[in-house]
């Protein structure tokens, strides 16, 4: 089982949309795949895929999950808020026929405030 996640870095404006993609590949067929998205180590959702369908379509605040055969799991955040900023990781495990798991690399999501003055103030507040 292998998991490739992208993009590595994503910068979007508050109120827009962010799309994180996880490609899950396995050399042999699987009957049930457990998937998980985490943000800063906390679980956003942990559905499974069987018969080509996700058991859950919601993933965290304003998060929508979709599965596109043969291998693409997409997390769409819409609309994006400032507290969506963080480090996202996709994890997958084949549960049936036999347990095998893998996880992607981190996607770092940066959300810029809709009001540019907020952005200037935030940057100005950094020490040094």
């Amino acid at each position: 089982l292998s998991v490739q996640q992208g993009p590595n870095l994503l910068q979007v404006r508050q109120g827009s949309q962010a799309t994180l993609v996880c490609q899950v590949d396995q050399a042999t067929a699987w009957e049930r795949l457990r998937v998980k998205w985490t943000k800063d180590g906390a679980i956003l959702c942990q559905p499974y895929i069987t018969n080509g369908s996700l058991s859950l379509g919601v993933c965290g605040p304003q998060g929508r999950l979709s599965w596109q055969a043969p291998s693409h799991l997409t997390l769409q955040l819409d609309p994006v808020s400032l507290n969506h900023s963080g480090a996202y990781v996709c994890w997958a495990a084949v549960e049936i026929p036999e347990l095998e798991e893998a996880e992607g690399n981190i996607t770092r999501l940066f959300v810029d405030p809709d009001d540019p003055t907020q952005n200037r103030n935030r940057i100005a507040s950094f020490p040094g």
Partner: antibody, heavy 120, light 113 residues
Framework: QVQLQESGPGLVKPSQTLSLTCTVS??????????WSWIRQHPGKRLEWIGY???????SYNPSLKSRVTISRDTSKNQFSLKLSSVTAADTAVYCC????????????WGQGTMVTVSS | DIVMTQSPDSLAVSLGERATINCLSS????????????LNWYLQKPGQSPKLLIY???TRLSGVPDRFIGSGSGTDFTLTISSLQAEDVGDYYC?????????FGDGTKLEIK
């Protein structure tokens, strides 16, 4: 590009252990998502998958041979090996190593094969 | 284990003519999770290792001539060579990767008539 080369004795006595090594060049056997297999071709041309070792060191064997087979690896030498115990004449075959990836699940690179004869 | 049954055992076809090889699996090789058939086709020329032609039942490997056509789904698969060339002679094998153990068909020997 990836190249695989089998090595080992061409003649093994019955009841002994067959030992072969596959040396991989141009690619690391620890690369995520890749599987390193042994396949044999019997004199009648029948192809038989023996088993694989994956990028993390996990193995999967053909149940018909599982009690006699061990596949291991040496990442420092970029090699993986086959041991088949208690051999009989039925184990006489051309033994090939081959690689396969999660993303493209087919044997895309093969060694040229080495003939192993089991005979006293 | 999934049993792969190939037919015919051997086949003689004239140059430029169509060659058809069949492969029947003992259980379905289609997954609704991935929308894929876990079936590959290989050609083995004398003195060489097998070389992949078709994967996922119908996808030609890059560089494989378009006269090689893979079709079928579930348990019934076909490899068609639309216009036989001299270099196409050899042994053809189907192979599944639906589950372990991976198994091959017994092969079809293709010759020129």
């Amino acid at each position: 590009q990836v190249q695989l080369q089998e090595s080992g004795p061409g003649l093994v006595k019955p009841s002994q252990t067959l030992s072969l090594t596959c040396t991989v060049s141009g690619f690391s056997i620890s690369t995520s998502g890749y599987y390193w297999s042994w396949i044999r071709q019997h004199p009648g041309k029948r192809l038989e998958w023996i088993g694989y070792i994956n990028y993390g060191g996990g193995t999967s064997y053909n149940p018909s041979l599982k009690s006699r087979v061990t596949i291991s690896r040496d990442t420092s030498k970029n090699q993986f090996s086959l041991k088949l115990s208690s051999v009989t004449a039925a184990d006489t075959a051309v033994y090939c190593c081959a690689t396969m990836a999660d993303r493209f699940a087919f044997f895309d690179v093969w060694g040229q094969g080495t003939m192993v004869t089991v005979s006293s | 284990d999934i049993v792969m049954t190939q037919s015919p055992d051997s086949l003689a076809v004239s140059l430029g003519e169509r060659a058809t090889i069949n492969c029947l699996s003992s259980q379905s090789l289609f997954s609704s999770n991935t929308n894929r058939n876990y079936l590959n086709w290989y050609l083995q020329k004398p003195g060489q290792s097998p070389k992949l032609l078709i994967y996922h039942a119908s996808t030609r490997l890059s560089g494989v001539p378009d006269r090689f056509i893979g079709s079928g789904s579930g348990t019934d698969f076909t490899l068609t060579i639309s216009s036989l060339q001299a270099e196409d002679v050899g042994d053809y094998y189907c192979q599944h990767h639906y589950e372990t153990p991976l198994t091959f068909g017994d092969g079809t020997k293709l010759e020129i008539k």
